[in-house]
């Protein structure tokens, strides 16, 4: 194919997005970053939320947005499914609000395909445990 060079996938160099079930990506990502270094910088701002443990899917979800999966078979990046986004949002948005912030517009779940199919490929992600959120009294986001 003439665009073979254009479609070549790149190894994921962001440490927090390695060993998540896929290991190659293609930039730009789903929020417009051209470089993995820029994506990594943005990802680090979510670390307090990941450490808080609001959703076991959060890290996979964020990585699927900032370093979406790439495959040589198709020339579009494969990001998260809307269902995973909604699950993460439902569990993590209340915690984000405790920090004083709103859910990012860049992670608006309506941007992602509702489910994985041949027309709209997306990643469902690992199953999210339906257990209560970590109990902290009172909630002190960022406190370890």
């Amino acid at each position: 194919f003439g665009d073979e060079e254009e479609r070549r996938c790149d190894p994921i160099r962001i440490s927090m997005c390695q060993n998540l079930g896929y290991n190659v990506t293609k930039m730009p990502n789903l929020v417009g970053h051209e470089l993995q270094t820029d994506a990594e910088l943005q990802l680090t701002t979510f670390t307090p939320l990941i450490q808080y443990g609001c959703s076991s899917q959060l890290q996979f979800f964020l990585c699927s947005v900032y370093v979406p999966m790439c495959t040589e078979k198709i020339n579009i990046p494969i990001g998260p499914c809307g269902g995973m986004c909604l699950s993460v949002k439902r569990r993590c948005e209340p915690v984000l609000k405790e920090f004083g912030f709103a859910w990012p517009e860049s992670l608006n779940c309506s941007k992602f395909p509702p489910q994985n199919d041949h027309n709209h490929m997306c990643m469902e992600g690992p199953g999210d445990e339906e257990v209560p959120l970590p109990h902290k009294t009172p909630i002190q986001p960022g406190e370890e």
Epitope: T45, F99, G100, F101, E143
Partner: antibody
Framework: EVQLVESGGGLVQPGGSLRLSCAAS????????IHWVRQAPGKGLEWVAS????????YYADSVKGRFTISADTSKNTAYLQMNSLRAEDTAVYYC???????????WGQGTLVTVSS | DIQMTQSPSSLSASVGDRVTITCRAS??????VAWYQQKPGKAPKLLIY???SLYSGVPSRFSGSRSGTDFTLTISSLQPEDFATYYC??????????FGQGTKVEIK
Amino acid sequence: EVQLVESGGGLVQPGGSLRLSCAASGFNISYYYIHWVRQAPGKGLEWVASIYPSSGYTYYADSVKGRFTISADTSKNTAYLQMNSLRAEDTAVYYCARSSFYWAMDYWGQGTLVTVSS
Amino acid sequence: DIQMTQSPSSLSASVGDRVTITCRASQSVSSAVAWYQQKPGKAPKLLIYSASSLYSGVPSRFSGSRSGTDFTLTISSLQPEDFATYYCQQSYAAYLFTFGQGTKVEIK
């Protein structure tokens, strides 16, 4: 409660050195960006340096590059600003601040005054 | 380097007035712009993040908006406690946090 407390400011001669500390409580600095921002008397805010302690990434304004060093000790939950080759124009109140989501600096310390004068 | 040109540098207004402060970025900074309020002898306080999102606990009379590379802070009805200096700040480049020059809002 989240708190940032700066210390280490004072009077120093041009060419001298000073080390500022920013002690954090109520959160773990490992997972946040910590910044130093300064404000010269009667002037506006100027970003100086930033660190992401869990990775050690550091960033500097051109005006201090090569003279100032930002660091952090996660075991003490404290960030530092080592200032060398100080100049009169470095005279300012130095604030430390944290940021996470959206890069917004949501908590600030009360500031510490650094005066560079002979 | 990205410059943030803030205007006006100062303004006089009365309680109840609508006040608008503008910051123009020298190049695209996405929406990663924050606004801060600072009173004499005090540390800055976060008002607006991501150009238009109101930080928790900030009164709803404060709002932010974006049009291209122009960012605006609006105080819909100025209150006595709002007399202060306001700064915009960009962080599109995570490693370069540029502040505007500041706008001092004084009592007319």
